[in-house]
């Protein structure tokens, strides 16, 4: 059976195409190609006499076909118009004609894409952008990329208009891109520059840095505010309700005691029209802002219940510092036989009971800082009775 | 079964017009080159003209050129010879035929009864 | 004048093999083909043969064609008085950009 076969089936703009034939009858006169999906003479494009050799072109005819003896039809420099179905008539010497019709698709070399945005500066949680890939052409796929990966499922992210359109709904700042849009068709693809959002968003609640509290006298007291925000906030300080000045930094050398107080930073977004602040409390004292770990020691760790008495001394190095002692999580003393003396330093349990047996520790504090140390474990063990060793009568 | 069935001849004066019809039945018209061929009373065959299966390629004979027009309504299926000019060497009866070869290997495989046009004053 | 040249008559006797010659030139008979046609009394024209020498279908073997160079020949074998006709030879003349017939030939079947 007389077949054609279109070589390739998808054409770029201004390539060629073969129509091949295949299974020609031998004993021809001649043939003719027809643009069309049937034989209308209005449609000729090219007839070809077997006998003379002679190539006659007709009414469909555009001067970039080629008819080869074997009846192929090239088509050269192809436009999108060339696109759709192709009939070939054979004229056998019996005078019974053979018909085949083919098709092929021409697609346009596809350009460089763009993307245009109708918002360019949305406001975090409150905008909504629309990005659109242009150009708008037929028969042409639309793809989105964001940081170089395809789009994520989100419902935040919606596709219209033939995925030409991709509409972020209630933009963040982690939406900032870059966003590339890709165009595709059977013959060819291109992908756009990329394309930043800029985000405006914040301020977030401000943080000063660093997160001490406590401070010397004759020490230098330096704070710095940073809160996330595009564009970057606007700054200010107030100590203790009062404006001190407007600047992300704040700095008060050789503070003393009079310098303790609140310490506010505020910040300002003045295109998102938001503030927010946050207060630090700042101590200058003499006291150690860190107290170091006490040790425990015991006069014994094993003992004999209701004969027994022991000491526990809790020792560390600070100065200004309160000693509180602990057993089984509760504090001590509990009972009549637990006596605390020398400033709660040492821990005396007369006489010991099975039930004072487990962990105790202590903790040193003072008004802005504590340490507790290790646990010390106190065993109590309490004499067997003597056994009876008596023979029974026989 | 393939019919062309010829009108439109008759006794017409030198100079004068006449337009035949050739009306095609049987078969699809708009696939074959169709052509005029006359028989003068008493001699041969002679071609006058042939058209394409689209319209696109016409010819005449050297005798007819100018005053002879062939032509085709597909819709129709009917082939048309309009005479204009007539000369008393134009008496003859006009048989259209076709062609089945597309003018590949020309030949006409079937032909009308024929229409007779007398040309005299 | 034609431009294919034709014996005006020929005859035969039934049973008989009776050839009628067509000469022309190369821009004719040397490079198209050459058709047969029969006209019997009152009738239109019959195609006989097409391509120098191929018979449609309802036409008897008895009729055969052949071409070398410039001239073809029409043979018919076995005569029968319904062959008594005119035979007129054609082809595509690419010179004149026409087509011609012979003068054509009278057979008469003698009998």
């Known amino acids: 059976q007389l077949t054609t076969e279109s070589m390739p089936f998808n054409v770029a703009e201004g390539k060629e195409v073969l129509l091949l034939v295949h299974n020609l009858p031998q004993q021809l006169f001649g043939y003719s190609w027809y643009k069309g999906e049937r034989v209308d003479g209005n449609r000729q494009i090219v007839g070809y006499a077997i006998g003379t050799q002679q190539a006659t072109p007709g009414p469909a005819n555009s001067g970039r076909e080629t008819i080869y003896p074997n009846a192929s039809l090239l088509i050269q420099n192809v436009t999108q118009n060339d696109t759709g179905f192709y009939t070939l008539q054979v004229i056998k010497s019996d005078l019974v004609n053979e018909e085949a019709t083919g098709q092929f698709h021409v697609y346009p070399e596809l350009p460089k894409p763009s993307i245009s945005s109708n918002n360019s500066n949305p406001v975090e949680d409150k905008d909504a952008v629309a990005f659109t890939c242009e150009p708008e052409t037929q028969d042409t796929t639309y793809l989105w990329w964001i940081n170089n990966q395809s789009l994520p499922v989100s419902p935040r992210l919606q596709l219209s208009n033939g995925n030409r359109t991709l509409t972020l709904l209630s933009v963040t700042r982690n939406d900032t891109g870059p966003y590339e849009c890709e165009i595709q068709n059977p013959v060819s693809a291109n992908r756009s520059d990329p394309v930043t959002l800029n985000v405006t968003y914040g301020p977030d609640t401000p943080t000063i840095s660093p997160s001490d509290t406590y401070y010397r006298p004759g020490a230098n007291l330096s704070l710095s505010c940073y809160a996330a925000s595009n564009p970057p906030a606007q700054y200010s300080w107030l100590i203790n309700g009062t404006f001190q000045q407007s600047t992300q930094e704040l700095f008060i050398p050789n503070i003393t005691v009079n310098n303790s107080g609140s310490y506010t930073c505020h910040a300002n977004n003045s295109v998102t029209g938001c503030n927010r602040t946050t207060v630090k409390t700042i101590i200058v004292t003499e006291l150690s802002p860190v107290v170091a770990k006490p040790q425990i020691k015991a006069s014994k760790t094993t003992v004999t219940g209701d004969k027994d008495s022991v000491n526990l001394t809790c020792s560390t190095n600070d100065t200004g510092i309160s000693i509180r002692w602990f057993f089984k999580n509760q504090s001590l003393p509990s009972s009549e036989r637990m006596k605390l003396s020398q400033g709660n330093t040492t821990l005396s349990i007369n006489p010991v009971k099975r039930e004072d047996a487990g962990t105790y520790w202590c903790e040193v504090f003072n008004p802005i800082s504590k340490n507790q140390s290790d646990p010390i474990m106190l065993n109590v063990n309490y004499n067997a009775l003597p056994q009876e060793n008596g023979l029974s009568p026989g | 079964e393939v019919q062309l069935l010829e009108s439109g001849g008759g006794l017409v004066q030198p100079g004068g017009s006449l337009r035949l019809s050739c009306a095609a039945s049987?078969?699809?018209?708009?696939?074959?080159?169709m052509s005029w061929v006359r028989q003068a009373p008493g001699k041969g065959l002679e071609w006058v003209s042939v058209?394409?299966?689209?319209?696109?390629?016409?010819y005449y004979a050297d005798s007819v050129k100018g005053r002879l027009t062939i032509s085709r309504d597909n819709s129709k299926n009917t082939l048309y010879l309009q005479m204009n000019s007539l000369r008393a060497e134009d008496t003859a009866v006009y048989y259209c035929?076709?062609?089945?070869?597309?003018?590949?290997?020309?030949?006409?495989?079937?032909w009308g009864q024929g229409t007779l046009v007398t040309v005299s004053s | 004048q034609s431009v294919l040249t034709q014996p005006p008559s020929a005859s035969g006797t039934p049973g008989q093999r009776v050839t009628i010659s067509c000469s022309g030139s190369?821009?004719?008979?040397?490079?198209?083909?050459v058709s047969w046609y029969q006209q019997l009394p009152g009738t239109a024209p019959k195609l006989l043969i097409y391509?120098?020498?191929k018979r449609p279908s309802g036409v008897p073997d008895r009729f055969s064609g052949s071409k070398s160079g410039t001239s073809a020949s029409l043979a018919i074998s076995g005569l029968r008085s319904e062959d008594e006709a005119d035979y007129y030879c054609?082809?595509?003349?690419?010179?004149?950009?026409?087509?011609?017939f012979g003068g054509g030939t009278k057979l008469t079947v003698l009998g």
């Open positions: 035929a076709r062609d089945p070869t597309k003018g590949y290997a020309p030949t006409f495989d079937y």
């Open positions: 049987g078969f699809t018209f708009s696939n074959y080159a």
């Open positions: 058209i394409s299966h689209g319209g696109g390629s016409i």
């Open positions: 190369s821009s004719n008979i040397g490079n198209n083909y």
């Open positions: 391509a120098d020498s």
């Open positions: 054609g082809a595509w003349d690419a010179s004149l950009n026409g087509y011609v």
